[in-house]
Amino acid sequence: MMTGTIETTGNISAEKGGSIILQCHLSSTTAQVTQVNWEQQDQLLAICNADLGWHISPSFKDRVAPGPGLGLTLQSLTVNDTGEYFCIYHTYPDGTYTGRIFLEVLESSVAEHGARFQIP
């Protein structure tokens, strides 16, 4: 039975041209994390494999940096980066946990971070 929960940075906003850290955290389970995939609307951004380390998609190397931790840093943000991002935790023996983050990239300096929330 899957008992864990994914805590994410939730709904967040950032300024065009700036950077943002996407963070997820798996809690309430003793399952071993074997891999974390980061996706943006079905496009792979990066993989962090427990044995092999980070794979940054060649399509995004100029704008994506690994970390901190299992998180992902998006750089040189554009309005087109607005949308849903998913952290997909592959664990043993539980299986797969998915967290969702919605990022809004704003033209001006009114960007504010949203509250954290949990996805069971």
Partner: antibody
Framework: QVQLVQSGAEVKKPGASVKVSCKAS????????ILWIRQAPGQGLEWMGD????????NYNEKLQGRVTLTADTSSSTAYMELRSLRSDDTAVYYC???????????WGQGTLVTVSS | DIVMTQSPLSLPVTPGEPASISCRSS????????????LAWYLQKPGQSPQLLIY???TGESGVPDRFSGSGSGTDFTLKISRVEAEDVGVYYC?????????FGQGTKVEIK
């Protein structure tokens, strides 16, 4: 030990399709990308595309104009490359190779010769 | 697309002597986040599949003789063979795996004089 074993040589007519298989062993198939590279007779190496069996993510070389499809069967640890609407200039040796992020293409299949001739 | 340019295209060598191959990319292959260059070198011996020699521009693949070494950063890279042996003949390719589409140099044919 790590091995990538490809299917045998094929002779096809122009306009036909070919499907080449690549059976992986000796490692966790879903952890690594499978890339497909081709080499025309006496020529250099060309990247065709890649697939990640652990998530079925795919990337393709736009020069192939949508004629190629990469698939993977995790139950048999086998990757497939299908090329459609074959032309004479598709005559080449087709290689599958293993890859992950920083480490480049560290193991290669033995190659599959595909000859396109009328 | 990133264009990879090798020189020379043909390299006659004498066994026991050093050899050097140059590779230039049309844009930087240095990933700032880890300060690694996504550049690999391969050797394709006659009638065989290519084999990986060097990745990250300068890291030798396991099992590759230490007479092979890679250097360079950004857009200019070099593969050196400290003392060529007869078994080193074949075509050497550099390849960038920084961005799609992955691209290769034209190849350098190394043959014994």
């Amino acid at each position: 030990q790590v091995q990538l074993v490809q299917s045998g040589a094929e002779v096809k007519k122009p306009g036909a399709s070919v499907k080449v298989s690549c059976k992986a062993s000796g490692y966790t198939f879903t952890n690594y990308w499978i890339l497909w590279i081709r080499q025309a007779p006496g020529q250099g190496l060309e990247w065709m595309g890649d697939i990640y069996p652990g998530g079925h993510y795919t990337n393709y070389n736009e020069k192939l104009q949508g004629r190629v499809t990469l698939t993977a069967d995790t139950s048999s640890s086998t990757a497939y490359m299908e090329l459609r609407s074959l032309r004479s200039d598709d005559t080449a040796v087709y290689y599958c190779t293993r890859y992950y992020g920083p480490y480049a293409m560290d193991y290669w299949g033995q190659g599959t010769l595909v000859t396109v001739s009328s | 697309d990133i264009v990879m340019t090798q020189s020379p295209l043909s390299l006659p060598v004498t066994p026991g002597e050093p050899a050097s191959i140059s590779c230039r990319s049309s844009q930087s292959l240095l990933y700032n986040s880890n300060q690694k260059n996504y550049l690999a070198w391969y050797l394709q011996k006659p009638g065989q599949s290519p084999q990986l020699l060097i990745y990250w521009a300068s890291t030798g693949e396991s099992g590759v003789p230490d007479r092979f070494s890679g250097s360079g950063s950004g857009t200019d890279f070099t593969l050196k063979i400290s003392r060529v042996e007869a078994e080193d003949v074949g075509v050497y390719y550099c390849q960038q795996y920084y961005s799609y589409p992955f691209t290769f140099g034209q190849g350098t044919k190394v043959e014994i004089k």
